[in-house]
Structure formats: C-alpha cells, structure tokens
Amino acid sequence: GSVKVLHEPSCFSDYISTSVCQWKMDHPTNCSAELRLSYQLDFMGSENHTCVPENREDSVCVCSMPIDDAVEADVYQLDLWAGQQLLWSGSFQPSKHVKPRTPGNLTVHPNISHTWLLMWTNPYPTENHLHSELTYMVNVSNDNDPEDFKVYNVTYMGPTLRLAASTLKSGASYSARVRAWAQTYNSTWSDWSPSTTWLNYYEPWEQHLGKPIPNPLLGLDSTGLNDIFEAQKIEWHEHHHHHHHH
C-alpha cells in the first residue's frame, strides 16, 4: 500500500550542532529502511544532505541532523522521501525552533548557613549565542512523598541554586533535576537532566560540614530564610508549564 505521513515532521535545534526532526507515519514503519529525510541550507552553494531516520516507536521516526553553528538567518529546506515518492516538503528555521541542550553535571553540596548548594553546568560554550540566554527550572522532590515537591526558577546568570535545608523535611531523601530554556529565542524547555539524590539531614549540621559554623540565621523561621535565597521559589503543577511548539 501507499506510504503516508500521519503527523508531519516537527523539528527543533539545539542551536549549536544538531537539529532533530520527529514525525509519525500512518502505520508501523521501519524508518531506516523505508524513509530518508533530505535537508539543505538555503544558501548559495549549499549541498543536499541526507538523514537516515531511526524508530522511536513503531510508527514514529526521528532524524538527527548535524548542522553548523546556527545563525538567525539559516533556513533549511526539508524533504521526506519514501524511495522516489516525496511524502512531505517543508522548511525549518533553527533560530525559531530552539530546544536547548540539557544542563549537565548536577551536584548538591552542603553550604554555610544551613543551605544546600545545587550546581550544574551550562551546556553551551561561552562563544555560543545561547550561553548567556539560558534560564533554568529546578525541580526538587521528596523521594517518598509525591506531594512534597518544589519548583525553582533560576533567572540569574549563574547555574547555581541555594536551598535552605529547613524548607525540606529533615531525614528525607530528595532528588533534584534541572532543565533550561532561552526566553529571547522563545524556545521550548530542554529535556530534564538526570536526577541527583541526597539525604536532607541537618542535625548536627556542624558534623556534616566537618567543622562548627556560626549560624546568624538560627533565629529566623523558614520565611526569613526564603528572603535571602538567590532564586525565586515557585510552587506549581508542571503540566501548566509544558510548551508545545511545532
């Protein structure tokens, strides 16, 4: 029978080296055997390139295309082929469909003043446009209590978050993960980083740090502690903040 596309390709770029397109066929398809996605930059002298898709599910195909360091003016012509049959043709502008790379190396360290210091790495080199554009969302959740989770927006430059231990349940195991987006590019969210887990015990905190530390905040309740955070804490349900771009 004839080959048909059910959901046409939706593409995103990490705006540095790779664009990924995904589409759904109308029936289970061996993507790599039956289909090819050709792509060509709309620029004088650009050659035609071919991407061999892989299966994500029975009828879902995905193609990862190496691109040069993207610039705003870049527009790609995309053609989806089944042999000699052109199934779909369209264009794709990476700068208009950005999905940032996933932040890396999320770690948690004990810090002064009864705080945890969460740190991660910006996934872009300093010379890339997106390096200075990223803001982050950090999700902190109790491993044993699905109701106990917090979401923090990190809108300042440094990839760090200071978290008061007193805002978390003592003795509980917590996991954190982080994702990024680029507001000026109207990007979608990156994938979540792998989670990192730690035990929130802060009595006796001095032993955990290896030496006694005077705590000028001892008399403050958790509201007072929140005032000195470098992140704005937002508690919400994540499904309100899913972005779907096509």
């Epitope: 930059l41 620029f43 004088m44 002298g45 050659e47 035609n48 390139h49 691109i67 040069d68 003016a73």
Partner: antibody
Framework: EVQLVESGGDLVKPGGSLRLSCVAS????????MTWVRQAPGKGLQWVSM????????YYADAVKGRFTISRDNAKNTLYLQMNSLRAEDTAVYYC??????????????????WGQGTLVTVSS | DIVMTQTPLSLSVSPGETASISCRSS???????????LDWYLQKPGQSPQGLIY???KRASGVPDRFSGSGSGTDFTLRISRVEANDTGVYYC?????????FGQGTKLEIK
C-alpha cells in the same frame, strides 16, 4: 601550488557552440564550488555561472540561462562550460575561479580566491 | 538582483598617500554577525583578477596589510594606505551572498 588552466576559447559564428575546460591542481577540487566569470573587451567583470563541489547545485546568470551548462568531473579535476546558441554579446575572456568550500553544511566563504589566466571566446560572423 | 555601485570610477593618487574606494549594495550583505558577503578584487593591466578582501574585511592570503576593508550591511570601503606604483589597476567589489553574484563597475586607480 593552486593553479587553474582554462582552454577551449576560439572564434565561433553566432548560433554556434563551444566547450570551455578548466583544469585544477593543488587543492581538493571536489570540496569547492567553482565559478565562471567573463569580461567583454574593455568592460568590467560579469559573473556567468557557479557549480557546487559535488556538482549537485548549479546557478546561472539570466543572460546565459538555457544556453550555457556548467558541469564538472571531479575524477579529472576539471570544470566545464558548454556554450550553445552563442551570440555576439558573449564575446569575452572567460575566467574560471575557485569559489566557496561546499563540503560543510553552510559553505565556508573565502571569495573567488584563485583565478585562471582566462580564455578568449570571440563570437562573430 | 543585488546591484553594486562603486565610487569613484577613477582615482589618481600620489605614492605614499591613502586611496579609498566606496561600494554600496542595493540589499544588505550581512548574513550573520561578522559575515558580510562582500569581496574586493584587483585586476592589474593585462592580468587576471586577484582576491584582496573577502567577507568585508578579511585579507586574502599574501595580501599586504596596506589593504584593508571595512563596512557592514550595504556600505563598504576599501582603503589602500601608502600607495605604491604596483597598486595600479582596476578594483572591483563583488557580492557573494546570493545568485546571481554581482560586481561593481570597477574603479580605475592611477598612481601619479
């Protein structure tokens, strides 16, 4: 040393045909787009045509579209310009030149960085 | 098509002085930051053209630093400092951004 040597220029009657060749050496020919530029006697430079490194993409000036065909043989490191239905206004020195690097996704541009010595095409009855 | 306009069409300069040639395009040649697809070429009498400047300001291999290119978007300038007798010839600007590639009319530089 990077070098381009054109040949094939001649005196031809209007409506006639001619094929110019340009043999390249000293660089990886298949990686670069190649261009033809012409110069009528006492006039300025006029771009004629360009072909990508693989030969998959070609471009032409309106004045020659449908009459001239650019091609290349990467195995022989040779660029060609097939000229049909020649007119008096096609009289010029024809230069081949090395253009942009096209093996990358976005071609890397260095201008027309090497030119041949040129070959004279005269169209006259 | 992008139209390239050079001024002046001829120029007479004494040795050691600075020569400036202007080139204006009918459309912006800026593709991305730092990438203006504008070249300068010199054709000496009886010779093939040779590349001087590409991408607006980058000197081609072997070109002395007396030659410099500047400008962005639609307005560009070639400056030749400490002009020498050997600099005589016709200077052309060319846009390499889109087909058809187009040249300026040429500027004839004469050394007094």
């Amino acid at each position: 040393e990077v070098q381009l040597v054109e040949s094939g220029g001649d005196l031809v009657k209007p409506g006639g045909s001619l094929r110019l060749s340009c043999v390249a050496s000293g660089f990886t020919f298949r990686d670069y787009a190649m261009t033809w530029v012409r110069q009528a006697p006492g006039k300025g430079l006029q771009w004629v045509s360009m072909i990508s490194g693989s030969g998959g993409k070609t471009y032409y000036a309106d004045a020659v579209k449908g009459r001239f065909t650019i091609s290349r043989d990467n195995a022989k490191n040779t660029l060609y310009l097939q000229m049909n239905s020649l007119r008096a206004e096609d009289t010029a020195v024809y230069y081949c030149a090395v253009d942009r690097l096209t093996k990358t996704i976005r071609p890397q541009y260095y201008g027309l960085w090497v030119w041949g010595q040129g070959t004279l095409v005269t169209v006259s009855s | 098509d992008i139209v390239m306009t050079q001024t002046p069409l001829s120029l007479s300069v004494s040795p050691g002085e600075t020569a400036s040639i202007s080139c204006r395009s009918s459309q912006s040649l800026l593709y991305s930051i730092g990438y203006n697809y504008l070249d300068w070429y010199l054709q000496k009498p009886g010779q093939s053209p040779q590349g001087l400047i590409y991408l607006g300001s980058k000197r081609a291999s072997g070109v002395p630093d007396r030659f410099s290119g500047s400008g962005s978007g639609t307005d560009f300038t070639l400056r030749i400092s400490r002009v020498e007798a050997n600099d005589t010839g016709v200077y052309y600007c060319m846009q390499g951004l889109q087909s058809p590639l187009t040249f300026g009319q040429g500027t004839k530089l004469e050394i007094k």
